[in-house]
C-alpha cells in the first residue's frame, strides 16, 4: 500500500481542516488508514482522524482544531496499521479556504431596489470576521447568458442593486461566496442559492 498523491490540506481558519489524498489502488480508507495530527506547541496532544473514502482510491479527513491562529503548525502522520506511509506538516494560516456565507436573502420590498443580505460565517472574535470580501453571483433561470458577478469589497454583508438592472417578469437566482485577502485565501464554496421573481414598475413613457 502506497500513497500516490500526498495529502493536501485546507483550513476554514476556525475549527476544521480538510485533508485529501490518493492511494495507489482501491482502499477502504476508514478501516485501513489513520491520519495522526499534532500541533507543534507545548502541552499539545496527538489526535487521530479516521478518513472517509472520496472515490475509489481517494481519501478525505476532517481534522478538528481548536483556537486556530497564524502561528500554528501541525505535524501529520499517515498510518496503515503499523506502517508509516507519509509524514508531513501543515500550517493552517497558509492554506485557508473560508467558510461559505449563509442565510442569503433577497429583499424585494424596497422601492425598485433589490437588497441582498447574507451572514458572515465567522464569529466576531475570529480574525477573518472583519476581513472577508464577497462575490455575489446572480443569474436568470430562463436565460443562461444573463449571468453576472458583483464584487462586494466592503465589510457589510449586503448588496443593493436597482431592480431595473435585471429583466422584469422573470425569475432569478443568487448565491454568494467569500475570500480574505489578508491570508491570500482561496474562494469559499458558494452559498446555497436563493430564488426570487423580479418585477418592477417601468417608468412612464413621455
Amino acid at each position: 500500500m502506497k500513497v500516490l498523491q500526498e495529502p493536501t490540506c485546507v483550513s476554514d481558519y476556525m475549527s476544521i481542516s480538510t485533508c485529501e489524498w490518493k492511494m495507489n489502488g482501491p482502499t477502504n480508507c476508514s478501516t485501513e488508514l489513520r491520519l495522526l495530527y499534532q500541533l507543534v506547541f507545548l502541552l499539545s496532544e496527538a489526535h487521530t482522524c479516521i478518513p472517509e473514502n472520496n472515490g475509489g482510491a481517494g481519501c478525505v479527513c476532517h481534522l478538528l482544531m481548536d483556537d486556530v491562529v497564524s502561528a500554528d503548525n501541525y505535524t501529520l502522520d499517515l498510518w496503515a496499521g503499523q506502517q508509516l506511509l507519509w509524514k508531513g506538516s501543515f500550517k493552517p494560516s497558509e492554506h485557508v479556504k473560508p467558510r461559505a456565507p449563509g442565510n442569503l436573502t433577497v429583499h424585494t420590498n424596497v422601492s425598485d431596489t433589490l437588497l441582498l443580505t447574507w451572514s458572515n460565517p465567522y464569529p466576531p472574535d475570529n480574525y477573518l470576521y472583519n476581513h472577508l470580501t464577497y462575490a455575489v453571483n446572480i443569474w436568470s433561470e430562463n436565460d443562461p447568458a444573463d449571468f453576472r458577478i458583483y464584487n462586494v469589497t466592503y465589510l457589510e454583508p449586503s448588496l443593493r442593486i436597482a431592480a431595473s438592472t435585471l429583466k422584469s417578469g422573470i425569475s432569478y437566482r443568487a448565491r454568494v461566496r467569500a475570500w480574505a485577502q489578508c491570508y491570500n485565501t482561496t474562494w469559499s464554496e458558494w452559498s446555497p442559492s436563493t430564488k426570487w421573481h423580479n418585477s418592477y414598475r417601468e417608468p412612464f413613457e413621455q
Epitope: 506547541f41 507545548l42 502541552l43 499539545s44 496532544e45 481548536d66 483556537d67 491562529v69 497564524s70 502561528a71
Partner: antibody
C-alpha cells in the same frame, strides 16, 4: 462573552501556600490554554506558567519550578494556581489569561500579600 | 526568564503620535510573533495587538504594531487622554523550553 472570574484577595505568612482560582465562562473551556502571570508592586508582568485544560498538562517558568502547581476542574470550568513556600517577593497581583501564543482575555487579578 | 527591553516612559500631547519599542533576541522576538498589552490604572491587562500587527475586534486602528528582526514597535496615533496607561510587549521563547517573556513595561503619559 468571555469571562474569567478570579477568587478574592489573600493574606499569607511566609512559608505558607496560596491557591487562587479562575472560573471561566462564555467559551469552550477545554479548547483554550490558560496562562498565569503576576505583577508585583512597582514591577512589570511576569509569566508563571500554562495549563492545557483539555488534558491537564502543565508547564511552568523555571523560576517557579517546584513551587507552583496548576490544576483544572472541567466540571466547573475552573483552573487553579497554587504557590507554596511563599516569601515576601511573591506579593503580587496574580492573573489568569486565556490564550495560546498570546493572552486574549484576562481575569481581573487576585492580590496575594505575603507578610509576617 | 528572558525579559524584553522597553523604554520606561514615553509622553506626547493629545492628538500626537507615539511609538514604543520592544527589543528582544533571536530565540524570542526573532523567531516568534509579538503581542502588545495595555494596562490602564487599576485594571487588568488588555490585548491590543497580536501576531505582530493584528488587532482584536474592538481595538481602534489608532493602535498598530510592527516587527523587524529582533525588535517590535507599537504605534499609537491620535493620542487621547484615555490612552494613558502602562504598555507591555510579549512573545514566547523556546531557547530553554517554552516560556512567555514580557517587556519591562512603558508608562505612557498624555501631556
Amino acid at each position: 462573552q468571555v469571562q474569567l472570574v478570579q477568587s478574592g484577595a489573600e493574606v499569607k505568612k511566609p512559608g505558607a501556600s496560596v491557591k487562587v482560582s479562575c472560573k471561566a465562562s462564555g467559551y469552550a473551556f477545554t479548547s483554550y490554554y490558560m496562562h498565569w502571570a503576576r505583577q508585583a508592586p512597582g514591577q512589570g508582568l511576569e509569566w508563571v506558567g500554562i495549563i492545557n485544560p483539555s488534558g491537564g498538562s502543565t508547564s511552568y517558568a523555571q523560576k517557579f519550578q517546584g513551587r507552583v502547581t496548576m490544576t483544572r476542574d472541567t466540571s466547573t470550568s475552573t483552573v487553579y494556581m497554587e504557590l507554596s513556600s511563599l516569601r515576601s517577593g511573591d506579593t503580587a497581583v496574580y492573573y489568569c489569561a486565556r490564550g495560546k501564543y498570546w493572552m486574549y482575555d484576562w481575569g481581573k487579578g487576585t492580590l496575594v500579600t505575603v507578610s509576617s | 526568564q528572558a525579559v524584553l527591553t522597553q523604554p520606561p516612559s514615553v509622553s506626547a500631547a493629545p492628538g500626537q503620535k507615539v511609538t514604543i519599542s520592544c527589543s528582544g533576541g533571536s530565540s524570542n522576538i526573532g523567531n516568534s510573533y509579538v503581542s502588545w498589552y495595555q494596562r490602564l490604572p487599576g485594571a487588568a491587562p488588555k490585548l491590543l495587538i497580536y501576531d505582530n500587527n493584528k488587532r482584536p475586534s474592538g481595538i481602534p486602528d489608532r493602535f498598530s504594531g510592527s516587527k523587524s528582526g529582533t525588535s517590535a514597535t507599537l504605534a499609537i496615533t491620535g493620542l487621547q487622554t484615555g490612552d494613558e496607561a502602562d504598555y507591555y510587549c510579549g512573545t514566547w521563547d523556546t531557547s530553554t523550553g517554552w516560556e512567555w517573556p514580557f517587556g519591562t513595561g512603558t508608562k505612557l503619559t498624555v501631556l
